[in-house]
Each structure stands twice: as C-alpha cells, then as structure tokens.
C-alpha cells in the first residue's frame, strides 16, 4: 500500500555537544517493522542511519555518524520513528532526509537541523 512520509515542517534546533531528535512517520500510520527506514544527507546521500531487515545496519553509515546515532523504534509498529544524534557538531547543520521503503515503494521527507553554539554571546557595546 502507498503512504506519505511526514517530518517536521520547521527547522529543529540543537546546541553543539547536545543530542537532538529528528522524528519521522508514515501516513496513514501502519506497521513499519518490516520496512527499510533511514536518514541520509543530501546532496551526496551520505547515510546517517539505516534500518533494514529488522536491524540497524551500522556498516552502511558515513564515518562521521558512526557511534553517534540511534533509531528510536518504540512506535515503529505505528509507523513512527525518531533518529537521535548524540554529541551534535556544527557540521551536522543542514538538511536531512528520512525515508521509508516498502518493497519497491519509497517515500521520503526532508527536514532541517540548525546547530547553535551554547557559548556564543554578544559582548556589551
């Protein structure tokens, strides 16, 4: 069956060094346990996280995300997942694309991460 993929409409904000969560879901909601689910970064499609055949595929990850990501799957039975990125870096800022693939049918949603410096301040004039 066909579905749409839905992610945040507005940029998600995170501080350098913190963790951030990027939610994504399919509509209408349905069990996505047997689907391939992942995040990549355009424009070069670097794999941030990949879930396939019921498990996380760590070997496919881009090196800069290895050991820093976790797919929260508690609600995957309803078609809802969240990518957690730990130890956020300035280089994480920008676009991310979440996708769900069911056999040959794939849909995706783009989202944006804004990364801010927790120690930034403006000196008094």
């Amino acid at each position: 069956g066909q579905f749409r993929v839905i992610g945040p409409r507005h940029p998600i904000r995170a501080l350098v060094g913190d963790e951030v969560e990027l939610p994504c879901r399919i509509s209408p909601g349905k069990n996505a346990t047997g689907m391939e689910v992942g995040w990549y970064r355009p424009p070069f499609s670097r794999v941030v996280h990949l879930y396939r055949n019921g498990k996380d595929q760590d070997g496919d990850q881009a090196p800069e995300y290895r050991g820093r990501t976790e797919l929260l799957k508690d609600a995957i039975g309803e078609g809802k997942v969240t990518l957690r990125i730990r130890n956020v870096r300035f280089s994480d800022e920008g676009g991310f694309t979440c996708f769900f693939r069911d056999h040959s049918y794939q849909e995706e949603a783009a989202m944006e991460l804004k990364v801010e410096d927790p120690f930034y301040w403006v000196s008094p004039g």
Epitope: G7, P8, R9, E19, R25, A75
Partner: antibody
Framework: QVQLVESGGGLVQPGGSLRLSCAAS????????MNWVRQAPGKGLEWVSA????????YYADSVKGRFTISRDNSKNTLYLQVNSLRAEDTAVYYC????????????WGQGTLVTVSS | EIVMTQSPATLSLSPGERATLSCRAS??????LAWYQQKPGQAPRLLIY???NRATGIPARFSGSGSGTDFTLTISRLEPEDFAVYYC?????????FGQGTRLEIK
C-alpha cells in the same frame, strides 16, 4: 492500553499556584511529546504547552509564558504543569495529551482536571 | 500564529442526513490538520489526522478532505451518537491552534 490520568486541580485564589500532574501508562512515555490543553467553561480548546520526549525542548502559548512551567519525569512516566500567578481567566479544565515528536495530532487525551481561580 | 476558523458555528440536522463542516487556516498548514469530536463532560477524541486519515476505531461514515488552507469534515449519514462539538486543529506550526468549534445539534 494507553491511559493518561490528570490530577492536582482545585480551587485557588488569584495569584496562587498549583502543580498539575498527568500519569501515563500503556506506552513508552519517553518516545512521545506531551501537551497540556485547556478548556474554559463553555468555551473551546486552547493549547497551553508542550514538551519533547526527552524533556529538552519546551513550548508555551503566549498567554501563559513566564507563569506556567511544563516538565516531565520519564522515570515516573509523569508529566507536570506548574501554574503560578493564576488569574481568573486561567479557570478551565486542563487536559494532557500525547503526540509524536511534534509532527502528529493529539491521539490520546486524559479526562481532565479542573482548575478554578476565584477569591 | 495560525488562526483556524470553523463554519458554521452551529449545524442543525436530523439523523440520517449528511453533515459538512468547514475549517479554514489563515495560512497554509499543508495536511497537518486534525478533527476532534467532543461530547459534554468528556475529553476530545481524535477522528481524522493528516487531513484525510481516519484514526483507529473511527467509523467509515467520517471522512476528511482538503489541504493548504481549506478543509472539510463530512459525516455521510448521521447517527444519534454523532451529535457533539467538532474541532479542527493544525499541528504543523507552534503554537498548535484549534478552531472555535462547530456544534452539531439534532434538528
């Protein structure tokens, strides 16, 4: 099955404070964002506040900003709303409701707890 | 803040008739729109999400349509238990906002 049970409402004088609680069960609490929505007697629904699943991000309606504080204890599966500097116009039934990551509607609601602000 | 406007405020119909409720957003909410039903003394219940999908356990007589700024909830054949207040809500932008409600009453 999913259950949300609010408590902590009551009669309070203007300027007073209360702490509302929402006990959650039947789902992985930390995976869901949580919201408070209120309804004044005979009126419509007004979103009040939201908090992310981890508790790291909070959001407020302008009408309560600086007076209300939302928080959660994921180890106790409980959502809170600290309400301070209460005004007569805060009189309402306060509902907790869950959503997924701020990208979903409110699919489950509690039964509500009544807050009455009157001298 | 996105303002949601529902019409009509009150709709008087008889069981078996078709009900059409409207909701308009002050700016595009894409398909991030839900419809809720509320009966006296009860919490709201989710009926429709993402503008057109029925929530779990909702009868097929309820349907939603629209995208962008204009949305419709249709109840194809009213049952006695359908008489209640209906709210639309956008959840695409914080603050999440509700319409003022449409009261569906028995004629």
């Amino acid at each position: 099955q999913v259950q949300l049970v609010e408590s902590g409402g009551g009669l309070v004088q203007p300027g007073g404070s209360l702490r509302l609680s929402c006990a959650a069960s039947g789902f992985t609490f930390s995976s869901y964002a949580m919201n408070w929505v209120r309804q004044a007697p005979g009126k419509g629904l007004e979103w009040v506040s939201a908090i992310s699943g981890s508790g790291g991000s909070t959001y407020y309606a302008d009408s309560v900003k600086g007076r209300f504080t939302i928080s959660r204890d994921n180890s106790k599966n409980t959502l809170y709303l600290q309400v301070n500097s209460l005004r007569a116009e805060d009189t309402a039934v306060y509902y907790c409701a869950r959503d997924y990551g701020g990208i979903s509607p409110f699919d489950y609601w509690g039964q509500g707890t009544l807050v009455t602000v009157s001298s | 803040e996105i303002v949601m406007t529902q019409s009509p405020a009150t709709l008087s119909l008889s069981p078996g008739e078709r009900a059409t409720l409207s909701c308009r957003a002050s700016q595009s909410v894409s398909s991030y729109l839900a419809w809720y039903q509320q009966k006296p003394g009860q919490a709201p219940r989710l009926l429709i999400y993402d503008a057109s999908n029925r929530a779990t356990g909702i009868p097929a007589r309820f349907s939603g349509s629209g995208s962008g700024t204009d949305f419709t909830l249709t109840i194809s054949r009213l049952e006695p238990e359908d008489f209640a207040v209906y709210y639309c809500q956008q959840y695409g932008s914080s603050p999440y906002t509700f319409g003022q409600g449409t009261r569906l009453e028995i004629k």
